[in-house]
């Protein structure tokens, strides 16, 4: 479905399993037609999404899509949680689905869990 509305391509209930101490880039894929919208990231706290004002972000431009990137350098244990990007476009606020980061703290994990273990049992990840 082609349209000139801004669209944010984050899958509903998507998830990423990452290690504390590693760098990580969380991408918000943005499709727009003419003027690039103003995009922000926020972190869910219950039903409220708290805007991430002081975090490093950047844009990556590709042919048919752009990416608004939230940088984690490095990932910290309290980065665990759900994030959402939002775009302001012609006075409208467009919100993405949330995406969840499961952070494994390497100090307390005896070995790096496999991707399948992390994906299938995310409730075990932050321990």
């Amino acid at each position: 479905k082609e349209s000139c509305d801004v669209q944010l391509y984050i899958k509903r209930q998507s998830e990423h399993s990452i290690l504390a101490g590693d760098p990580f880039e969380l991408e918000c894929p943005v499709k727009y037609c003419a003027n690039r919208p103003h995009v922000t990231w926020c972190k869910l706290n219950g039903t409220t999404c708290v805007k991430l004002e002081d975090r490093q972000t950047s844009w990556k431009e590709e042919k048919n899509i752009s990416f608004f990137i939230l940088h984690f350098e490095p990932v910290l244990p309290n980065d665990n949680g759900s994030y959402r990007c939002s775009a302001n476009f012609q006075s409208n606020l467009i919100e993405s689905h949330s995406t969840t980061l499961y952070v494994t703290d390497v100090k307390s994990a005896s070995e790096r869990p496999s991707k399948d273990e992390m994906a299938s049992r995310p409730w075990l990840l932050y321990r």
Epitope: Q7, I10, K11, R12, Q13, S14, E15, H97, D116, A119
Partner: antibody, heavy 119, light 112 residues
């Protein structure tokens, strides 16, 4: 349009494993979630698990955890369900399905694969 | 796990009459985006299931407008305003919010 074609019927002995395939067309499977559901003869629908083909992350119903494995090959747009330690109660039609990961635009089911477990 | 309970288990309706199927979830189906991911499927005899309705009330493309969905919270309804012979099928509600995904037990629609 989006279509799914599943592999053919299988007959297996108890204790064996089965691997069913599901090939998608009309969509980039990285933009979807693909999932497996089964239906025992004369019964309702039972969700087995799903995969995000973009990163390989899986989720399973507790009942199938450790016995079912869902994998995806994005180069061939194919998703697989492997079920091990088969028992007679696993006799069912196994359906793969695909839905749009972003906007709920589509939800399409395969034609089903009959798996019969019998000694 | 979320329990999805449909009623009735079966119903027989005359051609042109209204059919109503209810679905109750054991807890809210609202996702983090505030939307309820409640779908209705139709499974005709010998066929694969097919999605009719998603997000409680949105019709899939190609689905006749005699089908409609409604509800909120934990109570949802599928209505066929004027039943046709080709509507003979089993109808399932299912929730796409919580893991594991779960289905209602199905409601068999027959023509009286």
């Amino acid at each position: 349009q989006v279509q799914l074609v599943q592999s053919g019927a299988e007959v297996k002995k108890p204790g064996a494993s089965v691997k069913v395939s599901c090939k998608a067309s009309g969509v980039n499977i990285k933009d979807t979630y693909m999932y497996w559901v089964r239906q025992a003869p004369g019964q309702g629908l039972e969700w087995i698990g799903r995969i995000d083909p973009a990163n390989g992350y899986t989720r399973y119903a507790q009942k199938f955890q450790g016995r079912a494995t869902v994998t995806a090959d994005t180069s061939t747009s194919t998703v697989y369900l492997e079920l091990s330690s088969l028992r007679s109660e696993d006799t069912a039609v196994y359906y793969c399905a695909v839905n749009d990961g972003y906007f709920e635009y589509f939800d399409v089911w395969g034609q089903g694969t009959t798996v019969t477990v019998s000694s | 796990d979320i329990v999805m309970t449909q009623s009735p288990d079966s119903l027989a309706v005359s051609l042109g009459e209204r059919a109503t199927i209810n679905c109750k979830s054991s807890q809210s189906l609202l996702d983090s985006d505030g939307k309820p991911y409640l779908n209705w499927l139709q499974q005709k005899p010998g066929q694969s299931p097919k999605r009719l309705i998603y997000l409680v009330s949105k019709l899939d493309s190609g689905v006749p407008d005699r089908f409609s969905g409604s509800g909120s919270g934990t109570d949802f309804t599928l209505t066929i305003s004027s039943v046709q012979a080709e509507d003979v099928a089993v109808y399932y509600c299912w929730q796409d919010t919580h893991f594991p995904r779960t289905f209602g037990q199905g409601t068999k629609l027959e023509i009286k």
